[in-house]
């Protein structure tokens, strides 16, 4: 795997350049994304600009075209006119994209986290992880607070009360997921520690209930079972711990680290190929979903204020709050950073899946925004698993919406409970099968709100969930950008860099191999353990 040569240091401490990623050099990050920013002037420059941003433009166009195509087909008779077979065929190109992206997730998450964890010394790993989790926690809490505030201000529930004109419309208890809050969090813990790594690749643990007759009394007994769906949380935890363990092995583990890094690189090559198919897939994913929906107009008329509340909240958090946090800490233009990740954001909207967007997000933050590989590949998979700003915001809006709809009061204690539970359960959503709706049920149970109306939330979940996913992945990317900035600052502030450092007992005189004539900064130095490790590293085992 390609690594920049370490810089010699008189004290025997070798600071490995945090650009050790074969990507753009640090400091050039603004220039990198500047190509996206200023594209005016001569026709030549416009052509260059279009070529440089072709994929971004195609992806955005795909979303717009998808909406247009979907509405067009709906107007021409929609799902009824197409029939089930034709509808499946119509949605097929989108399904293909999802399958391609999901195919990549497992090797990508496991290899990138093992490589990322192994490439950082334990202290740096701990600091990076702690800062990342703090950022994720704070932004999720802010999203939750924004959701509650908006819902209390706009009162979507009172406006939508008419949708509930009959009890049947509200849905029944049988439809609403009924699971003990404690069992949900126990399932989360169980999924963090999978009993079988192979089955964790496609199954998760979930508690269900059986009614048993015990001494004449019917008792609800919890029964554990494996359900379909990758246990990404368990895989993430295992990969990080395994990476740390490999690093602890020292030279003995280097071969395996190099293997995982190479596997990771190969996976990213596949991602770069898939990226060019993304616009086609996204167009049909969006169009297919619109065609599938019946009475979209009626749904908007009835639940319009709730949808508005969710989308407005996502827009405020994604376009103002997160960029503001990024700007305050980095003093860099956050919108330039966002432009660099438009393709994965559009993919997030199209696929409605954080993990499916992960491969593209890694590629874009590394290549367009200059985030070092060991940061992006460590932080982004964790973010995709635990950082769910969009989900937390939607759940808070939904909880307040349901309270207003059923005319149930929300005092200060209940509001705080909603905030805390939404934040906690959004973190755990990846470890709880049937994610969003079940976690919403947990929040409602926590504040004694009716679960009858969850079916109303489900009716518009296809749209709100897309917006949630966009915000979720944006938060992950900006978190990676912030951490990159933190690493840059700690390196430039210290002669013995705090984060990416390798102690050496031998003098080093590596031979850099230039890879690009025009850029002397981009050199490959082949360290055996990939990013941020050097051949002669003799760090004592922890």
């Amino acid at each position: 795997m390609a690594v920049d040569p370490p810089k010699a240091d008189p004290k025997g401490v070798v600071a490995v350049d945090s650009t050790a990623n074969g990507g753009p050099a640090l400091g050039s990050r603004e220039d990198q994304s500047a190509k996206a920013g200023g594209c005016c002037g001569s026709r030549d420059r416009v052509r260059r600009c279009i070529r440089a941003n072709l994929l971004v433009l195609l992806t955005v166009a795909a979303v717009v075209a998808g909406v247009g195509l979907g509405l067009g087909v709906s107007a021409a008779g929609g799902a009824d006119a197409l029939g089930p077979a034709r509808l499946t065929a119509f949605a097929f190109p989108g399904e293909l994209l999802l399958r391609l992206l999901k195919m990549i997730i497992l090797p990508l998450v496991v290899c990138s986290l093992i490589g990322g964890a192994a490439s950082l010394d334990p202290g740096a790993l701990g600091r990076l992880g702690a800062w990342a989790l703090l950022f994720f926690l704070v932004t999720t809490l802010l999203a939750s607070a924004l959701g509650v505030g908006l819902a209390l201000a706009l009162q979507p529930g009172a406006a939508s009360a008419a949708i509930n004109a009959s009890v049947g419309a509200a849905g029944s208890a049988e439809n609403a997921p009924s699971k003990e809050v404690l069992d949900s969090f126990l399932d989360l813990a169980r999924n963090i520690f999978p009993s079988n790594l192979v089955s964790a690749a496609f199954r998760s643990y979930s508690t269900t209930y059986e009614e048993r007759n015990i001494t004449g009394t019917r008792v609800k007994v919890p029964v554990g079972q494996e359900v379909e769906g990758m246990n990404i949380l368990g895989l993430v935890v295992f990969a990080i711990v395994f990476g740390v363990a490999l690093r602890k092995l020292g030279p003995e583990g280097e071969l395996l680290i190099r293997f995982f890094n190479s596997f990771n690189e190969a996976t990213m090559v596949l991602v770069s190929w898939i990226m060019w198919y993304a616009p086609v897939g996204i167009m049909f994913l969006v169009a297919g979903k619109i065609v599938e929906m019946e009475d979209v107009g009626l749904l908007f008329a009835r639940l319009g204020k709730y949808i508005l509340c969710c989308l407005l909240g996502h827009a405020i958090h994604g376009l103002l709050v997160l960029p503001l946090i990024y700007f305050l800490f980095t003093r860099k233009n956050p919108y330039r950073f966002l432009w660099g990740i438009v393709t994965p954001l559009a993919t997030a909207f199209g696929t409605s899946s954080s993990s499916a967007t992960l491969p593209l997000m890694m590629k874009c933050v590394e290549e367009n925004n200059g985030v070092a590989k060991h940061i992006s590949r460590f932080i982004l998979p964790i973010g995709a698993t635990v950082n769910m700003d969009g989900a937390a915001l939607f759940q808070c809006v939904a909880a307040v919406f349901i309270a207003q709809l059923s005319q149930q009061s929300l005092d200060f204690v209940k509001i705080i409970t909603i905030l805390v539970t939404a934040t906690a359960s959004s973190v755990g959503a990846a470890g709880i099968p049937a994610g969003g709706v079940l976690t919403l049920a947990i929040i409602l149970e926590a504040v004694n709100l009716p679960v009858d109306h969850i079916s109303l939330i489900l009716a518009v979940d296809w749209l709100v969930d897309r917006s949630c996913t966009v915000l979720n992945v944006e938060g992950d990317a900006l978190g990676a950008g912030l951490l990159q900035n933190y690493v840059d600052r700690t390196e430039s502030r210290s002669t013995e860099p705090e984060l990416i450092q390798v102690k050496s007992e031998l003098p080093l005189d590596p031979l850099p191999v230039p890879t690009e004539e025009g850029n002397p900064l981009l050199k490959h130095y082949r360290g055996p353990a990939g990013d941020a490790t050097v051949a002669s590293e003799k760090e004592s085992v922890m």
């Epitope: 208890a173 009924s178 207003q404 009061s409 009716p450």
Partner: antibody, heavy 120, light 107 residues
């Protein structure tokens, strides 16, 4: 103190319309939903539905759609139950009950009940 | 709809007795069980909500317990004014449903 005062007993012929009132006092009327409950002589209580007093939207139980209508006069803190085209099986005592704003669906204060007798 | 069953339709007890009235739901109602008292030709009063919480102004001799599908109301020291019909009601999900009632009489 909180009180729900209902209108007096009614005697109606089949096919007529009846409107029962329920005047609330002692609390903010638009904060709590108002439910209607029916009790047939010698039988149990049956929930008819409720009205969202803030939005003014009625929600009806499955057996009470069509001839039954809930309405409000917010300025007078009064809820109404109107039964159109009354039938013999509508003979019962009708209660208005304030729906609690907590712990989902229960009724913390009740009116004294209005007896409706339908007889030809 | 969730069915609520009060197996005992009438109950005789002496003043000062400890009386227990039971109620069963057709499915788990997660403690959303409420108890009401209706005096003969009188109004209906809430006694207990959410299985065991005493409504304001209700004497402490009334208590509630239970979980899942089985619940009970206990009057620890029966008084003359407690002669009434007692209804249970589930508030877990729409539509709220009531038990058939248990009529309490003096022996």
């Amino acid at each position: 103190q909180i009180q729900l005062v209902q209108s007096g007993p009614e005697l109606k012929k089949p096919g007529e319309t009846v409107k029962i009132s329920c005047k609330a006092s002692g609390y903010t009327f638009t904060t709590f939903g108002m439910s209607w409950v029916k009790q047939v002589p010698g039988k149990g209580l049956k929930w008819m539905g409720w009205i969202h007093t803030y939005a003014g939207v009625p929600i009806y139980g499955d057996d009470f759609k069509g001839r039954f209508a809930f309405s409000l006069e917010t300025s007078a803190s009064t809820a109404y139950l109107q039964i159109n085209n009354v039938k013999n099986e509508d003979t019962a005592t009708y209660f208005c009950a304030r729906r609690s704003d907590n712990y989902r669906y229960f009724f913390d204060y009740w009116g004294q009940g209005t007896t409706l007798t339908v007889s030809s | 709809d969730i069915q609520m069953t009060q197996t005992t339709s009438s109950l005789s007890a002496s003043l000062g007795d400890r009386v227990t009235i039971s109620c069963r739901a057709s499915q788990d109602i997660r403690n959303y069980l409420n108890w009401y008292q209706r005096k003969p030709h009188g109004t209906v009063k809430l006694l207990i909500y959410y299985t065991s919480r005493l409504h304001s102004g209700v004497p402490s001799r009334f208590s509630g317990s239970g979980s899942g599908t089985d619940y009970s109301l206990t009057i620890s020291n029966l008084e003359q004014e407690d002669i009434a019909t007692y209804f249970c009601q589930q508030g877990h999900t729409l539509p709220p449903t009531f038990g058939g009632g248990t009529k309490l009489e003096i022996k």
